[in-house]
């Protein structure tokens, strides 16, 4: 038995930050579980880490780096991320595995979610165009 | 005006345990990532634990997972550290600190700090 | 975890002098660097933020500049206030780290 995963096909890091939900087929309130946020096709890398047991305070960490939080529903687990670099865009998988009360269970993979992070550009003012070019 | 009074510190034998509060003032403290960040002596500055502003998320360093415990009481405007299964390397002065929740790892206002001595 | 090397370690100079402080970091941080001013038995005072903005409050002797792996604290013109130590800090990636501090002492 798996659970069912739910994530936007598609989401734009503005300002290099992001919230990513994850949506699954199971209540994780009462429960011992790990839900985690990996990068690339092969989910090669594991971005961030949320722990939760028992509807007690989450426990977050990163073992790559990446600056990130995470929020509990019932159901969903919401990751966000903060100072996402543009080279960061790719596709990112969520995550579940619970491990009290038995059996443990884990999710079929889900479709992903491409994050496009977006630089910060500085464009010229139309009021002040930049010089122009003969 | 912006404070943060930390107390709680003191001499512990290793292995110990102490409870360091924080009392904030002069914002709105629910709204802020809050940190915890400790100095040994003569040494630099290491960060420690943060929560979040509701208090519903924590991380700590390696050094103190597992044996450290970050929590607050949005209501009493107080921050707190547990601190389990000390060590003579945590003797230090722990300092809370405040974060916006638009940066949560800038530091912007830092309490006076609460020394913690592990010695036997 | 992101290294921040902070040089020279002390830095010995007179009331009025210029003082040029560098953190160097162990890969990119971007701008998301921060300096703080550090007074024996006080607690540190935040500065600059994201390698060149001064915090509220902070007189305009104080700039910043760098980005990526390296970064400047320029303080134009010692004030006799200014003499302490000095630390960078990262948040670009988890988890913050500081330099070990730069000690700006009167000559």
């Known amino acids: 038995n798996k659970i069912l995963v739910k994530q936007s096909p598609m989401l734009v890091a503005y300002d290099n930050a992001v919230n990513l939900s994850c949506k699954y087929s199971y209540n994780l309130f009462s429960r011992e579980f790990r839900a985690s946020l990996h990068k690339g096709l092969d989910s090669a890398v594991e971005v961030c880490v949320v722990y939760g047991n028992y509807s007690q305070q989450l426990q977050v960490y990163s073992k790559t780096g990446f600056n990130c939080d995470g929020k509990l529903g019932n159901e969903s687990v919401t990751f966000y991320l903060q100072n996402l670099y543009v080279n960061q865009t790719d596709i990112y998988f969520c995550k579940i595995e619970v491990m009290y009360p038995p059996p443990y269970l884990d999710n079929e993979k889900s479709n992903g979610t491409i994050i496009h992070v977006k630089g910060k550009h500085l464009c010229p003012s139309p009021l002040f165009p930049g010089p122009s070019k003969p | 005006e912006v404070q943060l009074v930390e107390s709680g510190g003191g001499l512990v034998q290793p292995g110990g345990s102490l409870r360091l509060s924080c009392a904030a003032s002069?914002?709105?403290?629910?709204?802020?990532?809050m940190h915890w960040v400790r100095q040994a002596p003569g040494k630099g500055l290491v960060w420690v634990s943060r929560i979040n502003s509701d208090g519903s998320s924590a991380s700590h360093a390696d050094s103190v997972k597992g044996r450290f415990t970050i929590s607050r009481d949005n209501a009493k405007n107080t921050l707190y550290l547990q601190v389990n299964g000390l060590r003579a390397e945590d003797t230090a002065v722990y300092y809370c600190?405040?974060?916006?929740?638009?940066?949560?790892?800038?530091?912007?206002?830092w309490g006076q700090g609460t020394l913690v001595t592990v010695s036997s | 975890e992101i290294v921040l090397t902070q040089s020279p370690a002390t830095l010995s100079l007179s009331p009025g002098e210029r003082a040029t402080l560098s953190c160097r970091a162990s890969?990119?941080?971007?701008?998301?660097l921060a300096w703080y001013q550090q007074k024996p038995g006080q607690a540190p005072r935040l500065l600059i933020y994201?390698?060149?903005n001064r915090a509220t409050g902070i007189p305009a002797r104080f700039s910043g500049s760098g980005s990526g792996t390296d970064f400047t604290l320029t303080i134009s013109s010692l004030e006799p206030e200014d003499f302490a130590v000095y630390y960078c800090q990262q948040r670009s990636n988890w988890p913050p780290t500081f330099g070990q501090g730069t000690k700006v002492e009167i000559k």
């Open positions: 002069g914002f709105t403290f629910s709204s802020y990532w």
């Open positions: 994201d390698a060149s």
């Open positions: 890969q990119s941080v971007r701008s998301y």
């Open positions: 600190a405040r974060a916006d929740s638009s940066s949560w790892y800038k530091f912007d206002y």
